[in-house]
Interface confidence: low
Amino acid sequence: RAQLERSLRDVVEKTIQKYGTNPEETAAEESWDYVQFQLRCCGWHYPQDWFQVLILRGNGSEAHRVPCSCYNLSATNDSTILDKVILPQLSRLGHLARSRHSADICAVPAESHIYREGCAQGLQKWLHNN
């Protein structure tokens, strides 16, 4: 099981580091988006795992971005963000069979409503129960 957990971490790490770099190969990204969306988590250990990913970096002074699957919809009251940015992208995450041609990326504003927990704990718990 320890070996499986390490292998999983390695796969996730590569997925995060290469997120959005190849629009033609998104299977791993979509799977990880689905994990974040379903487990209500963000990143592997922490949401900040996403902060250094090249494709997610913008040009602003604090241009941190995360996949939209990191957003906690139940905690977001801003209807503009919900309607125009997050919901159209997250609507694809409700089912496994979906197609996507570009990475779904959302900015992290100062008071963001992203999941605060990483996914490692939840995934490891799931592994232990199966």
Epitope: R9, W44, H45, D49, F51, S112, R116
Partner: antibody
């Protein structure tokens, strides 16, 4: 501009207290772990303390009980309260922003430092 | 607590030289290591995170490698701006928070 500016350093007698401040601009302090690192004159870097985004605090073994890290998110400012100061605490104290990456951390943004001199 | 040991403490080199600095951890820290560059009177500047990753703006002549207990910082072709002191940092935020810096390596002009 994204930057950190420390203040509060100066000359203090052994046994005395001092509170250092670190004002952040260009980013929201509340989103980050923040830490203090010190450097004695002519010596290397030494980790002091970190406060994470949720407010949990961590200290170097030697700093526990004497130093207290805190933050005021409304003022976007980090603090280090130093009590029972000793001559060996003489150093430049740097405030730094910590980023986390796969269970590791590093300091990606540093202040210019503030010098604390403990002497009678 | 983890102890980081850097070697050498001082290194004399010329512009264009290939320079290698090593850092040894007293226990396994996986890839949880960062490198910093510091010039006299200035704050440190971070060079490498997670053992081998270069942040934005750091020249590609800097390369980090290693995992577990042995790590290396290599400057492929030393430039005038590279004469400085370099520090490694163990940065493991696992079950117990651990942070420690190496003693530093001063790269000076030969």
């Amino acid at each position: 501009e994204v930057q950190l500016v420390e203040s509060g350093g100066g000359l203090v007698q052994p046994g005395g207290s001092l509170r250092l401040s670190c004002a952040a601009s260009g980013f929201s302090l509340s989103n980050y772990n923040m830490g203090w690192v010190r450097q004695a004159p002519g010596k290397g870097l030494e980790w002091v303390s970190v406060i994470d985004a949720s407010g949990t605090t961590y200290y170097a073994t030697w700093a526990k009980g004497r130093f207290t890290i805190s933050r005021d998110n409304s003022k976007n400012t980090l603090y280090l309260q130093m009590n029972s100061l000793r001559a060996e605490d003489t150093a430049t104290y740097y405030c730094a922003r910590e980023l986390l990456y796969f269970g590791s951390s590093y300091y990606d943004l540093w202040g210019q430092g503030t010098l604390v001199t403990v002497s009678s | 607590d983890v102890v980081m040991t850097q070697s050498p403490s001082t290194l004399s080199a010329s512009v264009g030289d290939r320079v290698t600095i090593t850092c040894q951890a007293s226990q396994n820290i996986d890839s949880n290591l960062a490198w910093y560059q510091q010039k006299p009177g200035k704050a440190p500047k971070f060079l490498i995170y997670y053992a081998s990753n270069l942040p934005f703006g750091v020249p590609s002549r800097f390369k980090g490698s290693g995992s577990g207990t042995e790590f290396t910082l290599t400057i492929s072709s030393l430039q005038p701006d590279d004469f400085a002191t370099y520090y490694c940092q163990c940065a493991d935020v696992g079950s117990t928070y651990v942070a420690a810096f190496g003693g530093g390596t001063k790269v000076e002009i030969k």
